[in-house]
C-alpha cells in the first residue's frame, strides 16, 4: 500500500475548481524531493502535467498551481476552469520520476445538470433568498396555491394560501402575487440553507385541472478562495454579502473542526491574537466590507468566513464567503523586531523593511487605534507632514537601495505603548506591525543635552552640548535640525562659516554644536543622536528658541518646551513657526486607493511640496572631525 | 449542536451488502465533511471513509482496506451521508461511528472530527 494518501474520487461540474490536497510521510527527503500531478494514460504511462520544479503542461497553462506545505508534509494541486476533458487517471506523487511514491486519484467532471423542460433550475447561495415562479391558468385564479417539496413519492407542503406554513421554513416563506397579475404567484425562501436544496412542485387548483409546475433549487455551499501569502506579509479579506445585509453586523470568523471563532466584527469583538495587526473596514453602503491582516503567522492559516448577521455570530442561513489561506514559509519578507521597548524621556529606532526593488516608493508609520474596527492614521511619511502632537519628537529616515527605512521617535511617554504598522504605497505585503512598549525610565538617559534652558540670541554665537557616555564612543554623533519632513543631519563646521557646526572633544565624551551667528530661522528643534553606518540608536531633543537682543521675552518659552522634551510631550500644545498650511499633508491617493481603513494624515493638498529626504541634508556628514 | 444518528447495521453473511446512514440535525453551521471510522473489539478505533465538500465539488478518501467494496455518499437535502458495503468480510465486523466537521484536515485523523454519533453495530459471519 502506498505511504501517499489524498482523495480517491473527485467529481466536479463544468467550469468549477478543485483543490486536491496529497498527504506524504514526514521525512527530510519527503519534504524536499520533487513533488508531482500527472495523468495516467492507456499504455501505463504518467504524463506530468505540473510538478515542484515548475514545469507546467500547456493544458494546464493559466489554470493550475502546485504548492508544497512541508510543514504539513501535503501538498496542493488546484486545477481551475474544469471541462469534461480533464475527466480521468491521476496520480499525485514524489519522487524524480513518476514512478516513485504515489496515489491515484480518479477526477470526474460532468456537465451542468440538465432537467426536464417543464422545471425551472433555481441556482442560490446559502442564506440568500430564492423566489419561486409559479404560472397558473384562469380558471384556477381563486383556487388554493401551495408549494410542495418532493421527498420521494411524497410532496410536502412548503407553503399554500391558506396560512399554512412548513415549521421548517417558518418566518422564511411567504407565497404572495404582484399588483394586478392573475396567472402567476410566487413564494419566496429566504436564509436558504443546505437541506432546503431539492425538487418542489407549485400548484394552483385541486385534481386533474390543477396547473402545477416543477423547480429545482440547489442550494450552494461556498467555494473557498484559495489564498497564498508570505510569512510576515499582510492579506486583506474582501467581503460582498450583497445588499439584503448592508444593514447587519459583519464578522470576520476563522473556522475551526466545530465551528467558526469571530475574530473580528462590527459589533466591536475581536480575537486578542490580532490585536494591533486587524483592521475591518466597510466599503460602501452595500454591505461591502475588508479586513486586512498584518504580520501574517504560521498559525495564521487556515480556512476563514465573512458573513452578517445582527449578533455578529455565524448564523446558519445567513450569506457567507469562504477563504483557504496558505502561509508560504519561505517569505521574502526579512524578520525583523515584532516588539520593540523604550523607556520615558528615551528614545526608540524602528526599521521598517520594504520591498528593495520599490526604493522610490513613500513610506509611511502609522499608529494602530482599537477603537471601532481598528484603524491606522498616518503620523510620518516620505511626503506626508508629522501629525500634530509629534512635532520634534518623529521623523523618518529613508535610506534608498538598503529595503529599509528608520522611524525615530523620542520624547517617550508611557502613552506612547501600542500597536504601529510601516507600510508603503507600493507592495502591499510588505506591511510589518510592531508593538512599542514603554516603560517609567529608572535611570538618567544615556544622551543629556546642556544647558537644558536653551535660548539663542540673533547675530550672536550659541553652543549646546551633547554628553554621551563610552559605550557610544565608537559610534557616530551627529546634530540634526528636526523639520515637518525629517531631522536634516548639520553639515559638519568645514562645510562654510555661516552654516551650523559640529564639533567633538573625545576626552570628555561631549559632541557640540554650535550657531555662528544665530538666525531667527534657527529656531525649532534639534536632536542630538548616535548612529553606526545606517543603523540610527539613541537620540535626545531640545528645542532652541531664538531671541532679539533687544527683546527680554523669547519667542517661546523654552524652559516649557524643553519640559515637554523630558516629561509630558502628549500634554503640552507648543506654539510652531511653521505657517499653518504646513502642517496639512496630501498623501499620493495611490498608497490607499482602495484602503481607506488607514487614515490620511491631512486633507489639504500642499503646493510645491518638496519631497521629504529626512537625514540626508546632501549626503553631508554630522560626525565630528 | 450537532447531533448524528447512525442505522443500518446488522447482521449479515460473507460476500453480502449493507447500507449505513447517517443523519445529521440540530446543525447551527454547515459541516463540510462527515465519514465512517469503525471500531472493533479490542482494537482502536480506524478511518474507513469520508466524503468533503465544497460547493458542487465532492471529494471521497477510503482506507486502503476497503477500496473497491466501499462507496460513500451524500444527499444534501436529507443531510445523511451513506456508507454502501459491498463484498462484506468477516474481518469489517465492528461498531461503524459516523463523524463530522467543519473544517478537515487530515481526513484519517479521529481528531480532525467535531462530532460524532453513538455508533452501529456490524457483524459479518463467515
Known amino acids: 500500500q502506498s505511504p501517499i494518501f489524498g482523495p480517491q474520487d473527485v467529481s466536479s461540474i463544468e467550469g468549477n475548481s478543485v483543490s486536491i490536497t496529497c498527504y506524504y510521510p514526514d521525512t527530510s527527503v519527503n519534504r524536499h524531493t520533487r513533488k508531482y500531478w500527472c495523468r495516467q494514460g492507456a499504455n501505463g504511462y504518467c504524463a506530468t502535467l505540473i510538478s515542484s520544479n515548475g514545469y507546467l503542461s500547456k493544458e494546464y497553462s493559466g489554470r493550475a498551481s502546485l504548492i508544497n506545505f512541508p510543514e504539513n508534509s501535503t501538498f496542493v494541486i488546484n486545477i481551475a476552469h474544469l471541462t469534461q476533458e480533464d475527466t480521468g487517471s491521476y496520480k499525485c506523487g514524489l519522487g524524480t520520476t513518476n514512478r516513485g511514491l504515489f496515489f491515484d486519484v480518479s477526477l470526474e467532471v460532468s456537465q451542468v445538470p440538465e432537467f426536464p423542460n417543464d422545471t425551472h433550475v433555481y441556482t442560490k447561495d446559502i442564506g440568500r433568498t430564492v423566489t419561486i415562479e409559479c404560472r397558473f391558468k384562469e380558471g384556477n385564479a381563486h383556487s388554493k396555491k401551495s408549494l410542495c417539496k418532493k421527498r420521494g413519492e411524497a410532496c410536502e407542503v412548503v407553503i399554500d394560501s391558506t396560512e399554512y406554513v412548513d415549521p421548517s421554513y417558518k418566518d422564511r416563506a411567504i407565497l404572495f402575487m404582484k399588483g394586478t397579475s392573475r396567472d402567476i404567484f410566487y413564494v419566496n425562501i429566504s436564509h436558504l440553507i443546505p437541506s432546503d436544496a431539492g425538487l418542489y412542485v407549485c400548484q394552483a387548483g385541486e385534481g386533474p385541472s390543477a396547473d402545477k409546475n416543477n423547480a429545482d433549487l440547489q442550494v450552494l455551499e461556498p467555494e473557498p478562495e484559495l489564498l497564498y501569502k508570505d510569512l510576515r506579509s499582510s492579506v486583506t479579506f474582501e467581503c460582498d454579502l450583497g445588499r439584503e445585509v448592508a444593514n447587519d453586523a459583519k464578522y470576520l470568523c476563522r473556522k475551526n473542526k466545530e465551528t467558526c471563532d469571530v475574530i473580528i466584527n462590527t459589533l466591536g469583538k475581536r480575537d486578542p491574537a490580532f490585536e494591533g495587526r486587524i483592521l475591518l473596514t466597510p466599503r460602501d453602503d452595500n454591505g461591502r466590507f475588508s479586513v486586512l491582516i498584518t504580520g501574517l503567522r504560521k498559525e495564521d492559516a487556515g480556512h476563514y468566513q465573512c458573513g452578517a448577521h445582527s449578533s455578529g455570530l455565524p448564523q446558519e442561513g445567513w450569506p457567507v464567503q469562504a477563504w483557504q489561506l496558505f502561509v508560504n514559509e519561505e517569505s521574502t519578507i526579512p524578520n525583523s523586531r515584532s516588539v520593540v521597548k523604550g523607556v520615558t524621556g528615551g528614545s526608540v529606532a524602528i526599521v521598517c523593511p520594504y520591498n528593495p526593488k520599490e526604493s522610490s516608493s513613500l513610506k509611511y508609520w502609522c499608529h494602530w487605534e482599537a477603537d471601532e474596527n481598528g484603524r491606522c492614521p498616518v503620523l510620518v511619511g516620505t511626503q506626508a507632514l508629522v501629525q500634530e502632537g509629534y512635532e520634534g519628537r518623529l521623523a523618518l529616515f529613508d535610506q534608498p537601495g538598503s529595503g529599509a527605512y528608520t522611524v525615530i521617535l523620542n520624547q517617550l511617554t508611557t502613552q506612547d505603548s501600542g500597536f504601529y504598522w510601516c507600510l508603503t504605497d507600493g507592495d502591499s505585503r510588505w506591511r510589518t506591525t510592531i508593538e512599542l512598549q514603554v516603560a517609567e525610565a529608572t535611570k538618567k538617559p544615556d544622551l543629556e543635552v546642556t544647558p537644558q534652558n536653551a535660548t539663542a540670541v540673533i547675530g550672536e554665537t550659541f553652543t549646546i552640548s551633547c554628553h554621551y557616555p563610552c559605550k557610544f564612543y565608537s559610534q557616530e554623533k551627529y546634530w540634526c535640525k528636526w523639520s515637518n519632513d525629517g531631522c536634516h543631519i548639520l553639515p559638519s563646521h568645514d562645510e562654510g562659516a555661516r552654516q551650523s557646526s559640529v564639533s567633538c572633544d573625545q576626552s570628555s565624551q561631549i559632541v557640540s554644536m554650535t550657531l555662528n551667528p544665530v538666525k531667527k530661522e534657527d529656531e525649532g528643534w534639534y536632536w542630538c543622536g548616535v548612529k553606526e553606518g545606517q543603523v540610527y540608536g539613541e537620540t535626545t531633543a531640545i528645542y532652541v528658541a531664538v531671541e532679539e537682543r533687544t527683546r527680554g521675552s523669547p519667542h517661546i518659552n523654552p524652559t516649557d518646551a524643553n519640559a515637554r522634551a523630558k516629561d509630558a510631550p502628549e500634554e503640552e500644545a507648543m506654539e510652531s513657526s511653521v505657517r499653518e498650511d504646513e502642517n496639512k499633508a496630501n498623501l499620493d491617493p495611490r498608497l490607499f486607493a482602495d484602503e481607506r481603513e488607514i487614515q490620511n494624515a491631512g486633507d489639504q493638498a500642499q503646493e510645491n511640496r518638496a519631497s521629504g529626504n529626512a537625514g540626508s541634508a546632501g549626503g553631508q556628514s554630522g560626525s565630528s572631525k | 449542536e450537532v447531533q448524528l444518528v447512525e442505522s443500518g447495521g446488522g447482521l449479515v453473511q460473507a460476500g453480502d451488502s449493507l447500507r449505513l446512514s447517517c443523519a445529521a440535525s440540530g446543525r447551527t453551521f454547515p459541516t463540510y465533511a462527515m465519514g465512517w471510522f469503525r471500531q472493533a473489539p479490542g482494537k482502536e478505533r480506524e478511518f474507513v471513509a469520508t466524503i468533503r465538500w465544497s460547493g458542487s465539488t465532492q471529494y471521497k478518501y477510503y482506507a486502503d482496506f476497503v477500496k473497491g467494496r466501499f462507496t460513500i455518499s451524500r444527499d444534501n437535502a436529507k443531510n445523511t451521508v451513506y456508507l454502501q458495503m459491498d463484498s462484506l468480510k468477516p474481518e469489517d465486523t465492528a461498531v461503524y461511528y459516523c463523524?463530522?466537521?467543519?473544517?478537515?484536515?487530515?481526513?484519517?485523523?479521529?481528531?480532525?472530527?467535531?462530532?460524532w454519533g453513538q455508533g452501529t453495530q456490524v457483524t459479518v459471519s463467515s
Open positions: 463523524a463530522a466537521t467543519t473544517l478537515l484536515t487530515d481526513p484519517r485523523a479521529l481528531n480532525a472530527y467535531a462530532y
